[in-house]
Structure formats: structure tokens, C-alpha cells
């Protein structure tokens, strides 16, 4: 197999928050929200790299659920990479459990941008390779 | 229009080092991830390193890992292959390539033309 | 690692003639697999992306098909600027392999 290094800061995934388990309540550092808990974090990453440290906190790239959370979440960030993506531009959005994606995505028109960005309360389509904020979430 | 050129290839001694340079035009270079594949004499194509637009995630092969070191530096639009511990199969044409745009999916759309490395005594 | 086993390895065909091209994965890659034209001292060239879809710019006489393990390229008709080696490259996942290639000649 090929050799995979990544670079961890201190501040990324080697914090205690990695290996977190939702126990009812929010970890340390989190925010809880309407019966969700936030991780804001503060690195820039790629869409896949966001990915997968959430799941290295034993959470989820986060998700939009209604207006109000968007809301919040753009209080909170002025940006933040979401788990929506699509297999082209020929193909739907689509949640990462392959759930069409219900909320309209700007730009969507541009074939290189496949990946979601809630950008200033509204949702955006973005270049996946793009280094943005992430935020993980995980329902309690 | 989108390009990508590869300098920095010649004829090394077996033992040497040499650093490969990839420059990019006509896209957000810091947009996307990058790769080298090579060609040997004769031969088809070798993945060989790959590496993140944020520089978190990289990969080798198994050919060339301990050896070689990619990096890149978004600010110049460039992309680099530092080689050292040259060995005679390590001869071939290098090509710096983009990543497409979709996730999960690891293709090449767009490619430079090559540099040469010759390695022998 | 995923082996990418090409066939045939070469084949020779006139301007005209339809040409298909297999292409084995060792495992399944879903749809995850790509075809590149490569021509000696040029830079090589996308054609298909996603096991099925062109990529913009290639002419329609390029298709791909196939999904899992069983992929296809095939020529619709060859005109004279396609004669080269084609590669096809899994792209599900590390180390990337690539496919032998296929030198297409001519007749």
C-alpha cells in the first residue's frame, strides 16, 4: 500500500475531542445546539479532509437541517464546509447518506465546483480541493 | 488556458538528488491537489506522489517513499518532487499532474508535458 | 493494491474501424476509473472520467462503459489523430494504478 502522512497541528486532530464519545451530553470545546453538538473548528482543510476528521471525533461534516440551524451556524462562522457534494454537475446534491440534497446551492451551474460551503447564511457550491473552515456535528 | 510545465529533469549519478519543479498557469492552483506520475523507457504509466491543496494529505508509492518528497507552494503556483537517493530504475519521464474536480474520485485532468531523469553512472 | 490488467495490448486498425478496449480491476472500484490518450512527447490527455463520462472537449466517438471490475473504451470510429497508447487508471483509491496501455497502430 502507499505510505499516507498528514500533518497534525495541535490544534487539529490530535486533540481529546478525537476520540469523544456523545454520552448524552457535548464534549469539551463543543457547542450544543438544539439537541446537536458543534465542533468549530479552526483549521482549513479540503472538503474530503473535513471529512474525515470529523470522523475522527466520531461526528459528521456538518448538516443543515432547517433555516433556523443555518442561521445560527453563520453566527457562529462566516464559513464552513457542509456535507453535501454531487457526482457531477449532471447529478443531484445528495447528503452524505445519499439523501438528495432539499436546500438551493448557488453556482451550481459551474461543473468544477462539486462540493457544499454555507457561506453568509446561504449555501454555496465550491471547488472540493478548496482550503475552508469545517465544522463536525453529532445529533445527542 | 490551464497548463502546466515541468523543469528541473537531467542526466544524475546513482546516490544523487534532484528537485523537480511543476509550474502552474490558468487556474486557482491552491484549489487543487496535485500529483507525479512517471514513465520509465518503454514502460506505461507510475503514480508516484500525491499531494493535497492545503498540504495536510499526502501519499507515495511504495517505489519511491523514504526517498522522494512532494510539496508545493500555492503563493508560487507551483508544485515540487525532491528526489534523492537516486537509483538507475528511478530513469524515466516525470509529469506533474491536477486532480479533477469530483470527490472521491482520484483522476488526472490536465497534465504537463514531462521532464526527462536520467539516472546513471 | 488494486492491479489494472489492460487489454489487448495492442491492436491494429484502419481510419474507420471501431476499436474497444478492456480494462480489469483487480477489485471492485465502483465507477471509479479513468482513460487517458497518450501520444509520445505529449502530455497525456483525459478522455473519460467517472468509468462513463467525457470530459469536455474529447469527441463523441469516445465512450466509456463498465462499472466493478469490467471497464470498456471503445473508438466509434477511428480517425488519424487517434492512433496512440491509451491507459486506462482506477481512481477509487491509493496507490492510483494504471493499465498497461493499449498501443493502437495503423493497419
Known amino acids: 500500500p502507499s505510505t499516507l502522512i498528514q500533518r497534525h497541528n495541535n490544534s487539529s486532530l490530535n486533540t481529546r475531542t478525537q476520540k469523544a464519545r456523545h454520552c448524552g451530553h457535548c464534549p469539551e470545546e463543543w457547542i450544543t445546539y438544539s439537541n446537536s453538538c458543534y465542533y468549530i473548528g479552526k483549521e482549513r482543510r479540503t472538503w474530503e479532509e473535513s471529512l474525515l476528521a470529523c470522523t475522527s471525533k466520531n461526528s459528521s461534516l456538518l448538516s443543515i437541517d432547517n433555516e433556523e440551524e443555518m442561521k445560527f451556524l453563520s453566527i457562529i462562522s462566516p464559513s464552513s464546509w457542509i456535507g453535501v457534494f454531487r457526482n457531477s454537475s449532471h447529478h443531484p446534491w445528495v447528503t452524505m447518506n445519499g439523501l438528495a440534497f432539499k436546500h438551493e446551492i448557488k453556482d451550481s451551474d459551474n461543473a468544477e465546483l462539486n462540493c457544499a460551503v454555507l457561506q453568509v447564511n446561504r449555501l454555496k457550491s465550491a471547488q472540493c480541493g478548496s482550503s475552508i473552515i469545517y465544522h463536525c456535528k453529532h445529533k445527542l | 488556458q490551464v497548463q502546466l510545465v515541468e523543469s528541473g529533469g537531467g542526466l544524475v549519478k546513482p546516490g544523487g538528488s534532484l528537485r523537480l519543479s511543476c509550474a502552474a498557469s490558468?487556474?486557482?492552483?491552491?484549489?487543487?491537489?496535485m500529483s507525479w506520475i512517471r514513465q520509465a523507457p518503454g514502460k506505461g504509466l507510475e503514480w508516484i506522489s500525491y499531494?493535497?491543496?492545503?498540504?495536510?494529505?499526502?501519499y507515495y508509492a511504495d517505489s519511491v517513499e523514504g526517498r522522494f518528497t512532494i510539496s508545493r507552494d500555492n503563493a508560487k503556483n507551483s508544485l515540487f518532487l525532491q528526489m534523492n537517493s537516486l537509483r538507475a530504475e528511478d530513469t524515466a519521464v516525470y509529469y506533474c499532474?491536477?486532480?479533477?474536480?469530483?470527490?472521491?474520485?482520484?483522476?488526472?485532468?490536465?497534465w504537463g508535458q514531462g521532464t526527462t531523469v536520467t539516472v546513471s553512472s | 493494491d488494486i492491479q489494472m490488467t489492460q487489454s489487448p495490448s495492442s491492436v491494429s486498425a484502419s481510419v474507420g474501424d471501431r476499436v474497444t478496449i478492456s480494462c480489469r480491476a483487480s477489485?471492485?472500484?465502483?465507477?471509479?476509473l479513468a482513460w487517458y490518450q497518450h501520444k509520445p512527447g505529449k502530455a497525456p490527455k483525459l478522455l473519460i472520467y467517472?468509468?462513463?463520462s467525457l470530459q469536455s472537449g474529447v469527441p463523441s466517438r469516445f465512450s466509456g462503459s463498465g462499472s466493478g471490475t469490467a471497464f470498456t473504451l471503445t473508438i466509434s470510429s477511428l480517425q488519424p489523430e487517434d492512433f496512440a497508447t491509451y491507459y486506462c487508471?482506477?481512481?477509487?483509491?491509493?496507490?492510483?494504478?494504471f493499465g498497461g496501455g493499449t498501443k493502437v497502430e495503423i493497419k
Open positions: 490558468g487556474f486557482t492552483f491552491s484549489d487543487f491537489y
Open positions: 499531494i493535497s491543496s492545503s498540504d495536510f494529505t499526502i
Open positions: 467517472a468509468a462513463s
Open positions: 487508471q482506477q481512481a477509487n483509491s491509493f496507490p492510483l494504478t
Open positions: 477489485q471492485g472500484i465502483s465507477s471509479y
Open positions: 499532474a491536477r486532480r479533477g474536480s469530483l470527490p472521491f474520485n482520484y483522476d488526472m485532468d490536465v
